[in-house]
């Protein structure tokens, strides 16, 4: 059973989002991968890898860097100098053509807020990595990670086909808040 949850990441402006998406090696190692933002009904491709993917050959599009590790079945996504307007729902996809992409788990809800002067989040080169241990409160002043709700519908079928070969999707509600380090 595969749980599909929308994962929420909260940041201050200027920080860096670093996430990873895993995929089935045998199936998708040589496929192009893309990072997309859901804007209304139409997903917007922000960056995509070259084809065929090469190990440690990063693709940079503005503030976004994608690095595919086809030997490991992982795509690394990095968004630097986050801005409030970056807030939204993002997904990694196996990019086939604009009208059919396979969504990789899990969708990411990014929330970027203004950093107040002097807080760790206000540093332009500051980086945040999600930490691991569930707790009931987030670090004061720091960015945080939550997973407060589940994905109840897939992106519009006209643009994205959600593919989960060999998996039964079980939607569950997870409400953990995760402590995170704040790097200046």
């Amino acid at each position: 059973t595969t749980e599909l949850t929308e994962e929420k990441y909260e940041y201050k402006e200027g920080q860096t989002l670093e996430v990873k998406c895993d995929y089935a090696l045998e199936k998708y190692a040589n496929s192009r991968k893309a990072w997309q933002k859901m804007e209304g009904k139409m997903p917007k491709i922000l960056a995509k890898t070259e084809r065929p993917s090469e190990n440690s050959h990063p693709v940079q599009v503005g503030r976004i860097t994608l690095e595919d590790y086809p030997d490991h079945g992982l795509l690394q996504v990095r968004m630097t100098n986050l801005q409030v307007e970056d807030s939204g729902l993002y997904q990694c996809v196996i990019y086939q053509h604009p009208k059919e992409s396979h969504v990789l788990f899990n969708p990411i809800c990014l929330v970027v807020t203004k950093g107040s002067s002097g807080t760790p989040g206000s540093s332009e080169n500051s980086t945040q990595n999600v930490y691991r241990t569930p707790s009931t409160t987030a670090k004061a002043l720091g960015p945080r990670y939550t997973s407060p709700r589940t994905v109840t519908q897939a992106p519009p079928e006209s643009t994205v086909v959600v593919s989960t070969p060999g998996s039964e999707i079980n939607l569950t509600n997870v409400t953990d808040i995760i402590r995170v380090p704040v790097f200046n």
Epitope: S56, I108, N129, Y131, R132, P134, F183
Partner: antibody, heavy 122, light 107 residues
């Protein structure tokens, strides 16, 4: 209590396979990656690979590719690592370790199993 | 692969001494570095993640610093229970790699 409990020591012959289990408890099993790290006697730590217990996807370091298989059984919150075509230099303690939340590029191993000694000898 | 070079490989110090271990990466790894402690016959234990953030429950005498290629791990006042081998680990790029370890002993 968050913990990883591994299966017991194994003695096996060259060319054979070994399957080590790692049972997780005390946390949401499908939220965090499980990694495998090995350590030969008196040597340093060597990362072997990772598994996302939710998607079932996994990956391994080049030197183990084709010899290592990682699987999981979510109903019993257990991850397995099978290493085949064993050689004498595979003799080591094999650890499972919890990594970061599966969607995060955060590879710190905060919970470790007690280790499983695998001896490969003819 | 990124090579992680730890120095010294071993050291001996007195209780109360300040102990410093360095870890050098073969290329820039930002602050994607963790430090572990391993006591004989035991599994490693995470002490510091993200170059300098102390793991919950770890005594404040342990600290980490650095960014880029050069990192430092410090025990401000060595205690008898700190006898162990310490490892750094980078996670900037795959594969993840560890330093060779630094064995800390009491004089």
């Amino acid at each position: 209590q968050v913990q990883l409990v591994q299966s017991g020591a194994e003695v096996t012959k060259p060319g054979a396979s070994v399957k080590v289990s790692c049972k997780a408890s005390g946390y949401t099993f499908t939220r965090y990656d499980i990694n495998w790290v090995r350590q030969a006697t008196g040597q340093g730590l060597e990362w072997m690979g990772w598994m996302n217990p939710n998607s079932g996807n996994s990956g391994s370091v080049q030197k183990f590719r084709g010899r290592v298989t990682m699987t999981r059984n979510t109903s019993i919150t257990t991850v397995y690592m099978e290493l085949s075509s064993l050689r004498s230099d595979d003799t080591a303690v094999y650890y499972c370790a919890r990594g970061g939340i599966s969607s995060s590029w955060h590879w710190a191993f905060d919970i470790w199993g007690q280790g499983t000694m695998v001896t490969v000898s003819s | 692969d990124i090579q992680m070079t730890q120095s010294p490989s071993s050291l001996s110090a007195s209780v109360g001494d300040r102990v410093t271990i360095t870890c050098q990466a073969s290329q820039d790894i930002n602050n994607h570095l963790n430090w572990y402690q391993q006591k004989p016959g035991k599994a490693p234990k995470l002490l510091i993640y993200g170059a300098y953030t102390l793991e919950t429950g770890v005594p404040s005498r342990f600290s980490g610093s650095g960014s880029g290629t050069d990192f430092t791990f410090t025990i401000s006042s060595l205690q008898p229970e700190d006898i162990a081998t310490y490892y750094c680990q980078q996670y900037d790029k795959l594969p993840l790699t560890f330093g060779g370890g630094t064995k800390v002993e009491i004089k």
